[in-house]
């Protein structure tokens, strides 16, 4: 069914077209029971609860009501480049005997969860496959979903951001059981080139794919490990050149800032990755502001004037909770002649594979 939220001028700001299936566990006098049901065709947008976001707030919401007091709410949020369903909540009334026969309590319950529903601004979110959102005792599955918030002109955009499940998988594997982790294991990250220049020319050349490995506690007290790829298309690179320190700063999606610091040992004339700092936001974490730093690393080493190259995936452990997986790295710091990589020093991992 199609659900539309309009502002006072009659302009649509949220459009959503999907079918939904609910699976609810509840208690009866004879023990726990599971009830599954679909979003009925007469489900309606609750106009006085839905919103395009009031002046100087950025939280549009879509509230859908059905049955005797059930509501499904999608709360949206955004930054400069992306929007997402930050929170999905479901309110259900156990006194609705049609949906919850023999329920031992007659109370109204509310469950909520963050979601993986996100898309680029000015693109619609499209997911033909089922998108599951797990909440306490409730699982909501959206099918054949087209959703867009922050609309410019009261219609879905032609362009779309597809959900992970719809994207072709590189290898066909049997379906895995559902995992509590909010994000599937991503493919290898895209390799991108970075360079940092100063008044004396280029001081850093790097080509690599970057993947963040984060372990943190979620709001529900479970510990989860997530792999996040740095998407070069959504990353701005900058940096600085110094006599003893070269930095590469990457500003990526979700207010992620990843900083690499390269140092030099003057006596041995070798450069190395000395430090990594990460600042990011994890919406489902108990403490959403995730920070990690280590300035005493000794990775990616080579002689100044040469380049360090490694085709094998390298794992750089920053803290107990954070490491960086670096793919197909080729890097040269401090002295870069003519903007080109110098003589290659292969990593041990590659030499062992020859």
């Amino acid at each position: 069914a199609m659900f539309i939220v309009k502002n006072g001028n009659g302009t649509a700001c949220i459009m959503a077209n999907f079918s939904a299936a609910f699976s609810v566990n509840y208690d009866t006098k004879s023990g726990p029971k599971n009830m599954t049901f679909d979003l009925p065709s007469d489900a309606k947008v609750v106009l006085n609860s839905s919103s395009c976001g009031k002046e100087n707030t950025s939280d549009p919401s879509l509230v859908i009501a059905f049955g005797r007091g059930q509501t499904l709410t999608l709360n949206f949020t955004r930054n400069a480049t992306r929007y997402s369903v930050q929170l999905m909540s479901f309110v259900y009334n156990l006194s609705d005997t049609h949906l919850f026969p023999n329920a031992s309590s007659k109370e109204i319950k509310t469950v909520e969860s963050i979601t993986d529903i996100r898309a680029d601004i000015d693109k619609k979110y499209r997911c033909v496959s089922g998108t599951q959102v797990h909440m306490n005792n409730v699982t909501v599955t959206l099918h054949d979903a087209t959703i867009q918030a922050y609309l410019s002109n009261s219609s879905f955009s032609r362009e779309e951001t597809r959900c992970e499940q719809d994207r072709p998988s590189p290898t066909t594997a049997p379906p895995a059981p559902p995992s509590p982790s909010p994000s599937p294991v991503p493919e290898s990250p895209s390799v991108d080139k970075y360079n940092v220049s100063g008044t004396n020319g280029t001081c850093l050349l790097a080509s690599m794919g970057l993947q963040l490995n984060l372990t943190y506690e979620r709001k529900d007290n479970t510990t989860v490990t997530r792999l996040l790829n740095i998407n070069p298309n959504k990353t701005l690179a900058s940096g600085s050149c110094g006599a003893h320190l070269v930095t590469l700063e990457l500003h990526s999606e979700g207010s992620t800032v990843l900083l690499f610091q390269f140092g030099m040992n003057a006596s041995s004339s070798r450069f190395f990755l000395q430090g990594i700092q990460l600042n990011t936001t994890l919406p489902d974490a108990r403490d959403p502001a995730f920070k990690a730093a280590n300035s005493s690393l000794r990775a990616l080493q080579a002689t100044v004037g040469n380049s360090y190259k490694c085709n094998a995936e390298e794992h750089v452990r920053v803290t107990k909770a954070f490491s960086v997986n670096i793919f197909k790295v080729w890097v040269q710091a401090f002295k870069v002649e003519g903007g080109q990589f110098g003589s290659v020093e292969e990593c041990l991992l590659d030499e062992n594979n020859m």
């Epitope: 707030t57 950025s58 955004r78 930054n79 480049t81 410019s152 298309n233």
Partner: antibody
Framework: QVQLVQSGAELVKPGASVKMSCKAS????????IHWVKKSPGQGLEWIGA????????PYSQKFQDRATLTADTSSSTTYMELSSLTSEDSAVYYC???????????WGQGTLVSVSS | DIQMTQSPPSLSASVGGKVTITCKAS??????MAWYQDKPGKGPKLLIH???TLQPGIPSRFSGSGSGRDYSFSISNLEPEDIATYYC????????FGGGTKLEIK
Amino acid sequence: QVQLVQSGAELVKPGASVKMSCKASGYIFTNYNIHWVKKSPGQGLEWIGAIYPGNGDAPYSQKFQDRATLTADTSSSTTYMELSSLTSEDSAVYYCVRANWDVAFAYWGQGTLVSVSS
Amino acid sequence: DIQMTQSPPSLSASVGGKVTITCKASQDIDRYMAWYQDKPGKGPKLLIHDTSTLQPGIPSRFSGSGSGRDYSFSISNLEPEDIATYYCLQYDNLWTFGGGTKLEIK
């Protein structure tokens, strides 16, 4: 209707900074990005950066990353751009533009002329 | 940042004639291409977005095409008021303008 009203012309000395404003009206300020675009005879049109007033998130182009700072005051629905270490190359008209990323529904301000001269 | 290479930097044509401007992106921009007309003392005017969609009120003498990294923009039946500088703009990943093409009428 959507309106973007920019601050007046500025005459500044080389090495100084300039801060210009863009006051928005006629729409929910926090629902759209404000982009800043430079127009100069020598360089043509250049995108400087954008800010999402809802949370201050501001991607910049690499060229202006170190010298431009975009901020937004939601209480007055005003966006600001500060440009530092000015040179004669920065003499130009600067436009603020209301758009997300799709350009089809963009609204442009009237422009602020900045002249850098000693 | 995505780089946009626009050519030619300038061109001259006769009234009633046709001109074509090209823009090449440093990577695939998925048809997120727009074309602007810029005249001295005025703000830039959007002519085409999404590679080939004309803005309301823009005459059909203006057209655009392309995909992937390569895009072109044409004006047929040139009129004197078409004298301007034309810019391409990619908006697939942030925004990047091309260097501009100054059109003169012979």
